[in-house]
Interface confidence: low
């Protein structure tokens, strides 16, 4: 008789999840010699231990502490780039501007980027059929708690000028319910962070509006200012040109506004 299995509203664990995590860990330690000491098998064991045999709606930050400890990494605290709803461009940027880091440029962020995972209460099985959806099922699911944990730690580590890339094509350029709006903004440390600089990325080629005047950006400015952190905002009208000029700052066309 097949055992009854909880059906969740979200997609199941990513195919070949264990192999993917291990492979990514190995690849990361190849590219980053400062993380060469990391034992990827232990990392996987700690990752697995955070959610296997646990109810996937009852995961806590505490469950991820062994993994957090193993993945401890020092990134230059003044070179942090946060993003919201514009991951691809943020990652393209840090691939070019190699001295800046998004969360996904760190080991733990790299391991989990774009993956889904969950287990089942009281069995050692990984659930490849379905996992809890944050809205429809529960917020304390393995994926959401992981990102909340690593995002909080990443924001806490930031210092000096912190940059955030925001998507100017969305109705809410700053969304209080995003990971950036609900976790990272509130965990920047005012005693370390002097300024949060927002880069609002425009979508349309003919869009010349000043999106820094958008009501949601003003809301972000208000939240940040109340936390005794200065706020500044820049429009990035031409993201393609922006990336090109990061690559080749000497290009004559890069002196004009981008």
């Amino acid at each position: 008789v097949p055992r009854w299995r909880q059906q969740w509203s979200g997609p199941g664990t990513t195919k070949r999840f264990p192999e993917t995590v291990l492979a990514r860990c190995v690849k990361y330690t190849e590219i980053h010699p400062e993380m060469r000491h990391v034992d990827c098998q232990s990392v996987w064991d700690a990752f697995k231990g955070a959610f296997i045999s646990k109810h996937p709606c009852n995961i806590t930050e505490e469950d991820y502490q062994p993994l957090m400890k193993l993945g401890t990494q020092t990134v230059p605290c003044n070179k942090i780039l946060l993003w919201s709803r514009i991951k691809d461009l943020a990652h393209q940027f840090t691939q070019v501007q190699r001295d800046m880091f998004t969360l996904e440029d760190t080991l733990l962020g790299y391991l989990a980027d774009d993956l889904t995972w969950c287990g089942e209460f009281n069995t050692s099985k990984i659930n490849y059929q379905s996992c809890p959806d944050w809205r429809k099922d529960c917020s304390n699911n393995p994926v959401s708690v992981f990102w909340k944990t690593v995002s909080r730690r990443f924001a806490e580590a930031a210092c000096d000028v912190v940059h955030v890339m925001l998507n100017g094509s969305r109705s809410k350029i700053f969304d209080k319910n995003s990971t950036f709006g609900s976790v990272e903004v509130h965990n920047l440390q005012p005693e370390k962070v002097q300024t949060l600089e927002a880069w609002v990325i425009h979508g349309g080629r003919e869009d010349s509006r000043d999106l820094c005047q958008d009501p949601t950006i003003k809301e972000l400015e208000s939240i940040i200012s109340k936390r005794n952190i200065q706020f500044s905002c820049k429009n990035i009208y031409r993201p393609d040109k922006f990336l090109q000029c990061v690559k080749n700052p000497e290009d004559s066309s890069c002196t004009s506004e981008i």
Partner: antibody, heavy 123, light 107 residues
């Protein structure tokens, strides 16, 4: 029980190629490396290269660059080492070995070895 | 590449005696060093990894020490089955490299 079983002895003509296989059984479903080492008669051990099957990432020692190709077929748990443009000094026993340590460029120690494949290059 | 130098080339020891084998790296390899034993006609066998950790099933009479550039393999009381060639290998930098080997023979 974890073991690596290599293909049988080969006799080859100078200028030809040889392809040695190494079939793994009982390996855990994890990221490991398969390294290739050779030992000429009465000589010491010499690294040729290695591959991480799950990543399909191969690296070769400078001495063999351009002449050696290491591949792996995850579906059959088999790694292959092909050496081309053979010369008499390539006569050696060729070993494959399983590497643990979970890093790419470094920190692999080799705990399980194949039985070795004797390749004789002679005209 | 990192050059590994083993000494002595040959060590003559009586059964029951202690054997000390040395391995020197041309630059630091941290603790990323392994020791292997090889008998005639056989594949190498891992004895020690991480400079000092005994591999599974290796008797306690084998011990490794050192870090950086100087390493030692000690066999506290040689048994008849321990007479073989011993190789050190660094796995800190690619290409990994072996020492030229130390032959431990019966005195």
């Amino acid at each position: 029980q974890v073991q690596l079983v290599q293909s049988g002895a080969e006799v080859k003509k100078p200028g030809s190629s040889v392809k040695v296989s190494c079939k793994a059984s009982g390996l855990p479903d994890a990221t490991y490396a398969i390294g290739w080492v050779r030992q000429a008669p009465g000589q010491g051990l010499e690294w040729m290269g290695r591959i991480i099957p799950v990543l399909d990432a191969a690296h070769y020692a400078q001495k063999f660059q351009g002449r050696v190709t290491i591949t792996a077929d995850e579906s059959t748990s088999t790694a292959y080492m092909e050496l081309s443009s053979l010369r008499s000094e390539d006569t050696a026993v060729y070993y494959c070995a399983r590497g643990l340590g979970y890093y790419l460029y470094s920190s692999y120690y080799f705990d399980i070895w194949g039985q070795g494949t004797l390749v004789t290059v002679s005209s | 590449e990192i050059v590994m130098t083993q000494s002595p080339a040959t060590l003559s020891v009586s059964p029951g005696e202690r054997a000390t084998l040395s391995c020197r790296a041309s630059q630091s390899v941290s603790s990323n060093l392994a020791w292997y034993q090889q008998k005639p006609g056989q594949a190498p066998r891992l004895l020690i990894y991480g400079a000092s950790t005994r591999a599974t099933g290796i008797p306690a009479r084998f011990s490794g020490s050192g870090s950086g550039t100087e390493f030692t393999l000690t066999i506290s009381s040689l048994q008849s089955e321990d007479f073989a060639v011993y190789y050190c290998q660094q796995y800190n930098n690619w290409p990994w490299t072996f020492g030229q080997g130390t032959k431990v023979e019966i005195k």
